[in-house]
Structure formats: C-alpha cells, structure tokens
Interface confidence: medium
C-alpha cells in the first residue's frame, strides 16, 4: 500500500512539476525591467525566451518575437536547449510511468516490469528537473551579470552629461515557477525510484539451498516463472518450479512470509 | 548608435508659446515611450511630460492644460507644444527616449539629448 501511494504521489507531483516546466518555458516574464532610476515610466519591458514584450501604463501590451538569432544570447539558446530537452523527457518519463502504476492493470504485466518502468520515468524525472533547474539558473546567471554591467555602465556619454541609460533587468516570474517546477519534478522522479525498490520483487540470497530443500517442503510441478508468481493455480503459497530443468541463473525464485527452507 | 537631437528652443515672453522638437535617429528597431524633462538653473531635472508608442500621454501637474506633448511615429520625432509660458518655465529641456535598438534581449536603453534652452523673460 505505501508502495503504490509512493508511486501515485510520485507521478502527481512530477505531473505538476513537469506542468510547470512548461508554463514557464512559454511564460514571457523571464527578466523585468528593473524600474529604479527609470526616466520614462510609461512603458515596462519585459522578456522571456522567445519574445520581448512592452506593457504601456495604459495596459496595453504589445510583443515582439526574436525572429533572428543575431543579437540574442548564446547563453539563450542553451537555456531554451535545456527547457525542451526537461519537457521532452518529462513527458516521456509521464507516458512510462501511467503503464508503470501499480493501480493500473495492463495485461498479465508483471511485477518487475512494472519496477524498472518505474525506475525509469524516476531517472527521466530526475534529468527532467534537474534540465530545468540549469537551465533557469544559467538564465539567472546571466541576469545578474547583466544587472551589474548595466549598474557600472549606467552613467555614460560626454562632458558628464548622461547620454544613455542601459535598462537593468531583474528576476521575473517564470524563473521561480522553473525553480520550483523542476524542484518537484526531481523530488517526483526521488520518489517514483523510492517506489521502485518495493515494487522490485527481491530476489532471494539463498537461492542455491532451495534447490538443496528437503523433498517434503517442496512440490515439484510443472508451470514454471508464471505458477512461481502467483498467476498460476497454485493457492497454498508454497514454492513451485519446473522440475529443476533451468540453470540457477534462469529461475528466478521469490520470497514470501510463507517460505521456509 | 542612437541620437536625439532637440530644436525649437529660444527666448519667449511670458504668456508667448514655443514648440520644441526632439528627432531620433540612427539604429532603432523601436521607440517605446518619449518624454520630456527639464533643469531649471541651480536645480535638478525635473519630469515634464511622456507619451507612449500608442498616443498615451501624461504630465506634471505645474504643466498640465498648457503643454502638450506629441509625437510622429513615422518620423521618429517628440513635439512639445509649450502655451501660457511663464518665467518659472525658464529651463534647458531634455527629450528621453526608452528605445530598443536592435531585436534581442537586454538591448532596451533609455537614450537623452543634449538639451535646448527655454528663457522665458519680458
């Protein structure tokens, strides 16, 4: 049970997670205009990764996209290279995991199926959050080196006479929604793997004395791995192989609270 | 790199009326907003009036029903129709231009001009 909330609670927060990393990759708040020391007050622009907008007092807005890639960032492109390559993944990682819920039953889909899928979409979370965590924090980067250069350039021109003042930019708002996206598609993909390691059936450390068991505790049928799992009709919970005919790397057996050797 | 250049300053009476003009030029892919400042002898500058790429205006009260500020987008000009002047109107006037020279990030600038002088005297 607490393997199956693990796994649920899992994929939901890295669905909201990977719902973030999206809305803030198309949000255009990446970077405001820092308004301190602003001579014209009537306009306040703002960027994201793939347009520039300006928002009159009035409430109008109006947007621009970047249609070349002169005079953008090289640091944009890895930033938007990162973002899409965590949303990519994330939803990957979200199609495997739906297949991967305990609560969801597909077929005869075993057990240890089910875990490494859940291992899986755990891993492709974990990239996916963490993409998106370098790649708002390269944005980041890149803002504060831009705020203290736009600071030191601020007061330039001739005779002392202030000719241009460099618009500051600061934070916007989808840098933290990407923080905190990635933040909970990393801890989703943590626990979709903590779920993973109950879901695994362990396999035994003893394996070689069960073939050395007493005859009495032991019934020989023939059925093989799906009688050995429970699929089969075998309903007293004791252990059943197929007659010793695969090499010990073949079979493998599992433990229950019913076994004895 | 981008200039503005203001024009229409001079001596005026009180109560005469005056029209200053503060052309952009150079590598501008867009003016957003204009404005108007001005520093008065001994003082420090002082906001006039502002105008946006659509037509919104606004002003400073001690200029308010007797300046009126405009621009020609097509042109890249600011215009200041300056009526009722008064002598505590004297000041040199600075035109301010939040532009966007080139597209990309971070390359908004707020550019000024080098200032023309108003005297208002009898």
């Known amino acids: 049970m607490a393997v199956t909330a693990c796994q649920g609670l899992g994929f939901v927060v890295s669905l909201i997670g990977i719902a973030g990393i999206i809305a803030a990759t198309c949000m255009d708040q990446w970077s405001t205009q820092d308004l301190y020391n602003n001579p014209v007050t009537a306009v306040f622009n703002y960027q994201g990764l793939w347009r520039s907008c300006v928002r009159e007092s009035s409430g109008f807005t109006e947007c621009r996209g970047y249609f070349t890639l002169l005079g953008l960032p090289a640091m944009l492109q890895a930033v938007r290279a990162l973002m899409i390559v965590g949303i990519v993944l994330g939803a990957i990682g979200l199609l495997v995991s739906i297949f991967a819920l305990k609560c969801i039953r597909i077929g005869s889909m075993e057990d240890s199926a089910k875990a490494n899928m859940t291992l899986t979409s755990g891993i492709m979370f974990i990239v996916s959050g963490l993409c998106a965590i370098a790649g708002v924090s390269v944005f980041a980067n890149m803002l504060v080196t831009n705020f203290w250069m736009s600071t030191a350039n601020m007061y330039t021109g001739m005779g002392g006479m202030v000719q241009t003042v460099q618009t500051r930019y600061t934070f916007g708002a989808a840098l933290f929604v990407g923080w905190v996206a990635g933040g909970l598609t990393l801890i989703g993909g943590v626990m979709m793997c903590i779920a993973c390691r109950g879901l695994a059936p362990e396999e035994t450390n003893y394996k070689a004395v069960s073939y050395h068991a007493s005859g009495h505790s032991v019934a020989y049928k023939p059925g093989g791995f799906k009688a050995s799992t429970g699929f089969g009709s075998n309903t007293k919970n004791k252990k059943i192989y197929d007659g010793g005919a695969r090499t010990e790397d073949e079979v493998q057996s599992y433990p229950s609270k019913h076994d004895y050797v | 790199e981008v200039q503005l250049v203001e024009s229409g300053g001079g001596l005026v009476q009180p109560g005469g009326s005056l029209r200053l003009s503060c052309a952009a030029s150079?590598?501008?892919?867009?003016?957003?907003?204009m404005a108007w400042y001005r520093q008065a002898p001994g003082k420090g500058r002082e906001y006039v009036s502002e105008i946006t790429s659509t037509g919104n205006t606004d002003y400073a009260d001690s200029v308010k029903g007797r300046f009126t500020i405009s621009r020609d987008n097509s042109k890249n000009t600011l215009y200041l129709q300056m009526n009722s002047l008064r002598a505590e109107d004297t000041a040199v006037y600075y035109c301010?231009?939040?532009?966007?020279?080139?597209?990309?990030?971070?390359?908004?600038?707020?550019?000024w001009g080098q200032g023309t002088l108003v005297t208002v005297s009898s």
């Open positions: 150079g590598s501008i892919y867009r003016i957003n907003a």
């Open positions: 301010a231009a939040f532009i966007i020279p080139s597209v990309g990030m971070f390359t908004s600038r707020t550019y």
